[in-house]
């Protein structure tokens, strides 16, 4: 089996305030098995924005079913953007621990801007 | 400059066999899954098969099941078509394709090649 | 097997018009795995938008997608003379990997 890869393609989306953004990733592998989660920043300060594991997201949806079989897909939609959402978004693979999951690889991450709502 | 060169294509009787090759240049092939997709003359576009960039799965279109085999030599950077048992309807023109990502099969296919045309007739 | 439907099969338009051309699914689809392109005649097709929604490089603004489920859509909002040619959807994902027939933009 290949080694996993998490692939984000955009490096930059840029979104009208108050439009949706979709933050696109996907895996290369099924293996290992574990949650995916996305963050917003880096680090020990990075702020998690969806967990598939657990926890509620109000404004955050899945592009695919997350728990279709043989799903690679693990892109989301942030709705009503605002300027405070700008960042670089990552979307991090674990690998199923005990008694905690383990960070297992990132992806390059996405830097999403923010625009002007039109007039 | 990102590129795919076809050949292989040519006139082959009822029930012959032609070999398809494509020639990658200017990025990491064996990093991309790849995909051959066919044209009959004045019909749309008809997707074939497909391959991981490992060339460990490999995936087909009913049309073509049991007939065309796909592969690859990432060495050699060049993805081949086996058509076996051809018949009237596989003739057209051949297209390889990369697909955009690394993950197989997600969000499209954005390299083509011009395409090499199969005409089977006897 | 999803079957993908494109309709209109030919829309004949001005330079300058808007084009809004629809691809419908056979049963929902996830937009990741939906794409579209465009032919010219003796060329090959080109990517034109990805995951339903996003432009591919090199595609201009005036090309965009949108839609979900079973709906999807490309307008093209003012048509250039370059943009008369064959669009095709796709659906990826899974196997097949099945094209749309077709919509073709000819001048009016």
């Known amino acids: 089996e290949d080694e996993l890869q998490v692939i984000q393609p955009e490096k930059s989306v840029s979104v009208a305030a108050g439009e949706s953004a979709t933050l696109r990733c996907a895996m290369t592998s099924l293996i290992p098995v574990g949650p995916i989660m996305w963050f917003r920043g880096a680090g020990a300060g990075r702020e998690l924005i969806y967990n598939q594991k657990e926890g509620h997201f109000p404004r955050v949806t899945t592009v695919s079913e997350l728990t279709k079989r043989n799903n690679l897909d693990f892109s989301i939609s942030i709705s009503n953007i605002t300027p405070a959402d700008a960042g670089t978004y990552y979307c991090v693979k674990f690998r199923k621990g005990s008694p905690d999951d383990v960070e297992f690889k990132s992806g390059a991450g996405t830097e999403l801007s923010v625009r002007a709502k039109p007039s | 400059e990102v590129q795919l060169v076809e050949s292989g294509g040519g006139l082959v009787k009822p029930g012959g066999s032609l070999r398809l090759s494509c020639a990658a240049s200017?990025?990491?092939?064996?990093?991309?899954?790849m995909n051959w997709v066919r044209q009959a003359p004045g019909k749309g576009l008809e997707w074939v098969s497909a391959?991981?960039?490992?060339?460990?799965?490999?995936y087909y279109a009913d049309s073509v099941k049991g007939r065309f085999t796909i592969s690859r030599d990432n060495s050699k950077n060049t993805l081949y078509l086996q058509m076996n048992s051809l018949r009237a309807e596989d003739t057209a023109v051949y297209y390889c394709?990369?697909?955009?990502?690394?993950?197989?099969?997600?969000?499209?296919?954005?390299?083509w090649g011009q395409g090499t045309t199969v005409t089977v007739s006897s | 097997e999803i079957v993908m439907t494109q309709s209109p099969g030919t829309l004949s338009l001005s330079p300058g018009e808007r084009a809004t051309l629809s691809c419908r699914a056979s049963q929902s689809v996830s937009s990741s795995y939906l794409a579209w392109y465009q032919q010219k005649p003796g060329q090959a097709p080109r990517l034109l938008i990805y995951g339903a929604s996003s432009r591919a490089t090199g595609i201009p603004d005036r090309f965009s997608g949108s839609g979900s489920g079973t709906d999807f859509t490309l307008t093209i909002s003012r048509l250039e003379p370059e943009d008369f040619a064959v669009y095709y959807c796709?659906?990826?994902?899974?196997?097949?990997?099945?094209f749309g027939g077709g919509t073709k933009v000819e001048i009016k």
């Open positions: 391959i991981t960039s490992s060339g460990r799965s490999t």
């Open positions: 394709a990369k697909d955009f990502t690394e993950v197989v099969g997600w969000l499209g296919m954005d390299v």
């Open positions: 796709q659906l990826l994902g899974s196997s097949p990997r099945t």
């Open positions: 200017g990025f990491t092939f064996s990093a991309y899954g």
